[in-house]
């Protein structure tokens, strides 16, 4: 799967949307690597 910074950002946005924004404060693109997905 795509692990560029932009892909990670979009995947994280989707995850935040599906979770209703209920995630850890540090769960942001620059803190999470591709391994988070």
């Amino acid at each position: 799967s795509c692990n560029t910074a932009t892909c990670v950002t979009h995947r994280l946005a989707g995850l935040l949307s599906r979770s209703g924004g209920v995630v850890k404060d540090n769960f942001v693109p620059t803190n999470v690597g591709s391994e988070a997905f």
Partner: antibody, heavy 119, light 107 residues
Framework: EVQLQQSGPELVKPGASVKISCEAS????????MNWVKQSHGKSLEWIGD????????TYNQKFKGKATLTVDKSSSTAYMELRSLTSEDSAVYYC????????????WGQGTTLTVSS | DIVMTHSQKFMSTSVGDRVSVTCKAS??????VAWYQEKPGQSPKALIY???YRYSGVPDRFTGSGSGTDFTLTISNVQSEDLAEYFC?????????FGGGTKLEIK
């Protein structure tokens, strides 16, 4: 309101260096990658590279390695791009851009910095 | 590097028409494609990400489709303010690359 405010136009001589700034506001600067893009006159867009403001880790387009250096100053929420050994081929508009999720999910671009390299 | 190719550099359309801008990737990029609109004297504006998702605030007359190597930006009910150049971009792998652009002219 999210804003990426870039420094003003630059007129520099061949062989010189220049440092362009991009000041971010309205979001947490360290949370999102900052991209830099070149647009030569009448031409398409070229991705230069990106930087993780959280740790300073960069990814460059091979074409711009040795030409561009990306840095950040977290204390002022400002990203920088230094271009060196300038030639007329470097004359272009340079943009910073960042995809933000919070407060608004959008791909924000700075207003562009025009660089003219001429003797 | 992945090459993104717009099939047409210029397209002419009329207000109220429907127009499709196409872009082809030199290799499979999945759905990792964005579309940008650039008006004269302005910064590029993001319209579409992940091939088919509109950013908030983008009018719903802009629709993205495609996956793999073939992508399309469709503008329904074209308005005079849609006069602009449109670029595709792949972000599936580094370096990110943009297409050469398609200039939309309004008759």
């Amino acid at each position: 309101e999210v804003q990426l405010q870039q420094s003003g136009p630059e007129l520099v001589k061949p062989g010189a260096s220049v440092k362009i700034s991009c000041e971010a506001s309205g979001y947490t600067f360290t949370d999102y990658y900052m991209n830099w893009v070149k647009q030569s006159h009448g031409k398409s867009l070229e991705w230069i590279g990106d930087i993780n403001p959280n740790n300073g880790v960069t990814t460059y387009n091979q074409k711009f390695k040795g030409k561009a250096t990306l840095t950040v100053d977290k204390s002022s929420s400002t990203a920088y791009m230094e271009l060196r050994s300038l030639t007329s081929e470097d004359s272009a508009v340079y943009y910073c851009a960042s995809i933000i999720i919070v407060p608004d999910y959008f791909d924000y671009w700075g207003q562009g910095t025009t660089l003219t390299v001429s003797s | 590097d992945i090459v993104m190719t717009h099939s047409q550099k210029f397209m002419s359309t009329s207000v109220g028409d429907r127009v499709s801008v196409t872009c082809k990737a030199s290799q499979n990029v999945g759905s990792n494609v964005a579309w940008y609109q650039e008006k004269p004297g302005q910064s590029p504006k993001a319209l579409i990400y992940s091939a088919s998702y509109r950013y908030s605030g983008v009018p719903d007359r802009f629709t993205g489709s495609g996956s793999g190597t073939d992508f399309t930006l469709t503008i329904s009910n074209v308005q005079s303010e849609d006069l602009a150049e449109y670029f595709c971009q792949q972000y599936n792998s580094y370096p990110y690359t943009f297409g050469g652009g398609t200039k939309l002219e309004i008759k």
